[in-house]
Amino acid sequence: MAVTACQGLGFVVSLIGIAGIIAATCMDQWSTQDLYNNPVTAVFNYQGLWRSCVRESSGFTECRGYFTLLGLPAMLQAVRALMIVGIVLGAIGLLVSIFALKCIRIGSMEDSAKANMTLTSGIMFIVSGLCAIAGVSVFANMLVTNFWMSTANMYTGMGGMVQTVQTRYTFGAALFVGWVAGGLTLIGGVMMCIACRGLAPEETNYKAVSYHASGHSVAYKPGGFKASTGFGSNTKNKKIYDGGARTEDEVQSYPSKHDYV
């Protein structure tokens, strides 16, 4: 039950995280105009990974896409790549994890296969989350660098009296969405990996040894781990005597294909 809950929760958390990564990637507010030095502006600028926008005081918003590919900063390209890789890995991970869910039966899929798929999706989620966090962090670092550079020469004198106020940009909402979403995807991935351990019965090299207690015949398998004839197989150890010591396999009973309608 705990394994199913962990796996299910991991899936849901990762799903929310990946939705967040997609949302952050599509959002226009990766960087927003810093209004600290110019709170009276009637024109508000903000930028995303794909386009830059200007909102006028009338509410009119005009967005222009970055139609050049070669003319864009390498860092921006890198952030785009990281976010896209994160989305692709996350999407594949979600697809894999759907089939890996313990509560979903597909044909006669063995638990070992489900465990492998859970682990695969978990790793994918972890990498996806890391990609998103890295992408957002690279962009944030770029903003901080540019912010202080523009602060250094905030006012450039043009012909004595004339001043041109340089537009400074600060963290936009998308950065926070990206960090949170990346973190959730990462957590979801870790949960899937933990669930995988619970799903997969581990192979042991110990042979089953029969101990004869006074008057009672009990099959006893040493070792703290689940022991079975095959990795992930559904075969249960048969009890020789009901009142005897239970194996871990019996405590953790595997659902059969008849358990779910």
Partner: antibody, heavy 120, light 113 residues
Framework: EVQLVQSGAEVKKPGASVKVSCKAS????????MHWVRQAPGQGLEWIGY????????KYNEKFKGRVTLTRDKSTSTVYMELSSLRSEDTAVYYC?????????????WGQGTLVTVSS | DIVMTQSPDSLAVSLGERATINCKSS????????????LAWYQQKPGQPPKLLIY???TRESGVPDRFSGSGSGTDFTLTISSLQAEDVAVYYC?????????FGQGTKLEIK
């Protein structure tokens, strides 16, 4: 047709208050910001502030802050400009002007103006 | 506040001749985000409210004759009337639309020579 119709001329004594109205028609009232601009006799134009009829948001020129209040009545599509503690230098024609949506923050329609005379 | 300075204060031009009015701002009105200039030109005839002629420094408002044109960028702007007509006699104002408080130039009175 877009129309901004302002209230009639007012004569006030120094220290008094005046409330000028501007009734909008021919467009969706809450979709456009309304600015107020004044013009002293023979002088240039001076921006007072604006009100957003959609959310009642306002912005004022620091010069008038504390003395001017912009309000709106959605039911009658009317905006009001109240100026208190009147001084002789407040004698001017007061205009309401609609901020155009795609006019780069420029005012595309203006009221006919309301002359406010402050005299003892 | 952004200070708008117009020149000349008054201008007399013959009918059919070109009239040029200049406007200088104390700060750049060019927005880096969209590379647009936030400057407007208004025409005010005696006893009338101002009328929008040009916005965004160079875009003519609908219904404005094409003899009116605006140019310039950053801090220096120009309103040009290519062929002066009798009905163009008025006071012309430039306005900062970039930052609050919105500020106007002192006005240029255009007359017929």
């Amino acid at each position: 047709e877009v129309q901004l119709v302002q209230s009639g001329a007012e004569v006030k004594k120094p220290g008094a208050s005046v409330k000028v109205s501007c009734k909008a028609s021919g467009y969706t009232f809450t979709s456009y910001i309304m600015h107020w601009v004044r013009q002293a006799p023979g002088q240039g134009l001076e921006w007072i502030g604006y009100i957003n009829p959609y959310n009642d948001g306002t912005k004022y020129n620091e010069k008038f802050k504390g003395r001017v209040t912009l309000t709106r009545d959605k039911s009658t599509s009317t905006v009001y400009m109240e100026l208190s503690s009147l001084r002789s230098e407040d004698t001017a024609v007061y205009y309401c002007a609609r901020l155009g949506f795609t006019t780069r923050n420029a005012m595309d329609y203006w009221g006919q103006g309301t002359l406010v005379t402050v005299s003892s | 506040d952004i200070v708008m300075t117009q020149s000349p204060d008054s201008l007399a031009v013959s009918l059919g001749e070109r009239a040029t009015i200049n406007c200088k701002s104390s700060q750049s009105l060019l927005n880096s985000g969209n590379q647009k200039n936030y400057l407007a030109w208004y025409q005010q005839k005696p006893g009338q409210p101002p009328k929008l002629l040009i916005y965004g420094a160079s875009t003519r408002e609908s219904g404005v004759p094409d003899r009116f044109s605006g140019s310039g960028s950053g801090t220096d702007f120009t309103l040009t009337i290519s062929s002066l007509q009798a009905e163009d006699v008025a006071v012309y104002y430039c306005q900062n639309d970039h930052s609050y408080p919105f500020t106007f130039g002192q006005g240029t009175k255009l007359e017929i020579k």
